[in-house]
Structures are given as C-alpha cells and as structure tokens.
Interface confidence: low
C-alpha cells in the first residue's frame, strides 16, 4: 500500500498510452515504405525505457538516445516545416502538401502527438493519475525532454530552405520560450540551411497589417541573421483560402498570387 | 545549485520541544521528499520521517511516532521538524535531507542542509 | 526493520590503494540502496543510488555493486580527499535504515 501519494500538478498518462503508441508505430511503418525496417515492439522498448522506472523530474535528453536512434529519418532539403502555436493550420497543410513535413509527420513525433506519460521512480508502473506539470512541477519531466530532444534532432538534419509557421494572432508572433523559439532556431545548421522562411498566419478576417514588420518577428530575423542562415518573411492573409489554393492550385482565384511577400 | 539552509543550534530542557526549520533554495520545493535524519554524537545516522510538501503527507520511523511533527509551507520552500518531550538522548545533529520518492515512498537523499545541533541538557 | 551491517568498522589503506566497503541487509532490499560519504563537521553527501549508478558529479573511481543482500562499495584509487567515513542506506522497506558506517582511515 502506498504510504505517500505521488501527486503532481499536470494530468496523468494518456490511457491505453502502450497501445496507442504501439497501433501507431505499427500504422505508420505500414504507410511509410521506409520505415518498413523499423521493428515496433523494439521502438516501444526504448520509449518504455526512457522514463519506466525514472523519478519524472530527472528525465534527460540521454534518456531518449536509444529511441531516437531507431526512429533516425530524413527530411528531403526544402521539406521541413517548423511550427509555432499553429500546429492545427500546419498539419492540415502538410496533410494536402504530401511532400512537406512537420515534426509529427515523422515517426517519432507521429507516435507522441497529444499524449502525455510518465513513470515513477523505482517501480515499473506508468503513472496514470498525474504527471509533473512544466510550469507548476519542472522542466525536465518525460514529455517535455522527448520533445525538445525531438524537435532539436528534427532541426539538426534540416536542409536547404526551411518554413515556419507562426501564429499571428497571438502577442508573441515570435517566441523565444517557445520549442520554435529555444530548441529548432539554434539547432538549425547553417552549413545546411540557406534560408529559414516564416510564414505569419493572420487570424483576423479584415487584417492587412504586415506582420512581418512585428518586433518579434525582427528579432528572429536578427537571430537568425546572425547564424549566418538567410531570413525571409510572408503574410497569409488568408489561411482559409491558403489551404484552399494548396489543395488546388489550378483555382483561378489562386493563380494571383496568395502570398504577401518580403524579402529581406 | 540546489540550498538547504538549516536554523542554528538550541539548547532544550528535558521535556521541553523544539523545532528546527529547512529553508530550501535552487530548486522546485514541492516535487521532492524532505526528510529528516539524526546523529548523536560519535554514531550514525538514523531517519526519524518525512513530508511530501505538495500533497502535506508525512511518515515517521516508529521510534518517533507521537514526538515528531514534519510540517512543509510551501509559500516559503520551508520545511519543519518539530521533537517534543526531549530528553538527553535526543542530543544530536539534525539534518533535513531532500530525496525524490515514489508513490511506495523509496528515496534516497541527493541534497543535504548543513545541519542542527540540539542539546538537551538540565 | 531491515538491519544494515557494514564492514569492516575502520579501514587502513594508503593513498592510491584499492578500498572495498560490504554491507549487508538483513534482507533483500533488492538494489534499493545508497551510498553517503561524511567528513567530520559536514553533512552526508550522496555517492551511488541504485546499489551502482553515480550521483552526479561523483568521480569514477567510486562504483557500487550488488543486490539483494550483499553489497559493496569500491574506491578505486584512494585519494587524499576520499578518507572519511561511509554509510550505506537501504530505501526498499519502511523505516529506511542506514549501515553503522565504515571508517576510511590514511594507513
């Protein structure tokens, strides 16, 4: 019997979380020609393996090297789609634009998308009544270390011209706190990368403003700028009709041009 | 860097109580074990109870049960053990000990505070 | 309650020498116990967690082996600094208890 109760502040293990990150790994292997090779109960062990038996605020980015190692996958240059508090927008487009990709379109993010997980130190067993909340707990808990050790590998192996959507309804069009913001901006290589393009997604139906002028967004102009990697800035105006002209791009209303340029 | 910065020395009558406080710094108070262990003069080490401070949860070694208090106030990241009915025997260093914990309550202790000494003495 | 009892209770050993520490558990404690070196004047610090995993920022030369009940701690090559004296804890069972403690003295 439990003589003290592990309570955290976030909420616990999504249920069902082996299963569901085992039916993944076996959907995508069978979708994805490539990762044909990839055995899912070896995948399952190393995530299992991460953090089964960790006290969750001790977790680190050496805990995931095993499973990152077996799910090692390439992005074609000028593939790579990063995203900022926009994931809903971004996945819809990568779903029409088959030949780009987010983070979740890969393997290890597609197993990990919108579950949460944690175990307990010493004992075998998976929490599911509570995990370390990042804010009100710590930083360094299961899912947010797999994250960051995700993102900055997925940043690493980028190549050529790399697009980023940002959220331009939120105060922080660019946020240095942000996955985006701390871990894929300085892991970009910029022996690799020649240019990083943002895309800056406007919510409101009447807005023309040029959020490519925000301060935020000169100030990843400037950081980026300063890693040698070239920066380049575009307003949607539109996302409805962006994912519309995505779709299709034959659309006589799309022909146009849809896209508000500035190139800096 | 993770602090545990203990209160100073006392001296106590017998029969009398006193409370030592554990004020921590550098890390998150609230996701850690507090415990407290004692050594007498020459001896070893021997750990009387703890406190979750995020859930207010406490357990003693049976030695102690019904003399020790823990209490945590989260507010300050200060933790609390409070020994009544003393007798010489309690003279001792006491050391609050941070630890991380499951829900079986196994820890270790990764952080120290410099320690208390109390003295019961008539 | 478990009963740790280590030895031996002083040990003599010359500065780069090997020094090997037991303990034992009156019963299996399975690999949930620690190691704490004390100076005189100072709190206890952790060395090894897990019967063998080093606490950060431990240098190599300390290692820990053994489950169940028969445990050891090894320091390699005894520095100036490592003279002092060391515990063992079990936290597999309720109260966790330490060892009496092995003193590490220069010979």
């Known amino acids: 019997v439990p003589r003290w109760r592990q309570q955290w502040s976030g909420s616990g293990t999504t249920s069902r979380f082996p299963e569901t990150v085992l039916a993944r790994c076996v959907k995508y292997t069978e979708v994805h020609p490539e990762m044909r090779h990839v055995d899912c109960q070896s995948v399952w062990d190393a995530f299992k393996g991460a953090f089964i038996s960790k006290y969750p605020c001790n977790i680190t980015e050496e805990d995931y090297q095993p499973l990152v190692k077996l799910g090692t996958q390439t992005v074609p240059c000028n593939k790579t789609l990063l995203w900022s508090r926009i994931k809903d927008l971004a996945h819809q487009f990568t779903q029409v634009q088959r030949d780009m990709f987010t983070l979740e379109d890969m393997l290890l993010g597609y197993l990990a998308d919108d579950l949460t997980w944690c175990g307990e130190f010493n004992t075998f067993e998976i929490n599911y009544q509570s995990c370390p909340d990042w804010r009100k707990d710590c930083s360094n808990n299961p899912v947010s270390v797999f994250w960051k050790t995700v993102s900055r590998r997925f940043a690493e192996t980028a190549c050529g011209v790399v697009h980023v959507m940002l959220n331009g309804s939120r105060s922080k069009i660019f946020d240095k706190n942000s996955t985006f913001g701390s871990v894929e901006v300085h892991n970009l290589q910029p022996e690799k990368v020649q240019a990083l393009e943002a895309w800056v997604i406007h919510g409101g139906r009447e807005d023309s403003r040029d959020l490519c002028q925000d301060p935020t967004i000169k100030e990843l102009e400037s950081i980026i700028s300063k890693r040698n990697i070239r920066f380049f800035c575009k307003n949607i105006y539109r996302p409805d009709k962006f994912l519309q002209c995505v779709k299709n791009p034959e659309d006589s209303s799309c022909l146009s041009g849809i896209h508000h340029h500035h190139h800096h | 860097q993770v602090q545990l910065v203990q209160s100073g020395a006392e001296v106590k009558k017998p029969g009398s109580s006193v409370k030592v406080s554990c004020k921590a710094s550098g890390g998150s108070f609230s996701i850690y074990a507090i415990s407290w262990v004692r050594q007498a003069p020459g001896q070893g080490l021997e750990w009387m109870g703890g406190i979750i401070p995020n859930s207010g949860d406490t357990d003693y070694a049976q030695k102690f049960q019904g003399r020790v208090t823990i209490t945590a106030d989260e507010s300050t990241s200060t933790a609390y053990m409070e020994l009544s009915s003393l007798r010489s025997e309690d003279t001792a260093v006491y050391y609050c000990?941070?630890?991380?914990?499951?829900?079986?309550?196994?820890?270790?202790?990764?952080?120290w505070g410099q320690g208390t000494l109390v003295t019961v003495s008539s | 309650e478990i009963v740790m009892t280590q030895s031996p209770a002083t040990l003599s050993v010359s500065p780069g020498e090997r020094a090997t520490l037991s303990c034992r558990a009156s019963?299996?404690?399975?690999?949930?116990l620690a190691w704490y070196q004390q100076k005189p004047g100072q709190a206890p610090r952790l060395l090894i967690y897990g019967a063998s995993t080093r606490a950060t920022g431990i240098p190599a030369r300390f290692s820990g082996s053994g489950s169940g009940t028969e445990f050891t701690l090894t320091i390699s090559s005894l520095q100036s600094e490592d003279f002092a004296v060391y515990y063992c804890q079990q936290y597999n069972n309720w109260p966790w208890t330490f060892g009496q403690g092995t003193k590490v003295e220069i010979k």
């Open positions: 000990a941070r630890g991380p914990y499951d829900s079986y309550g196994e820890s270790y202790f990764d952080y």
């Open positions: 019963q299996s404690v399975s690999s949930n």
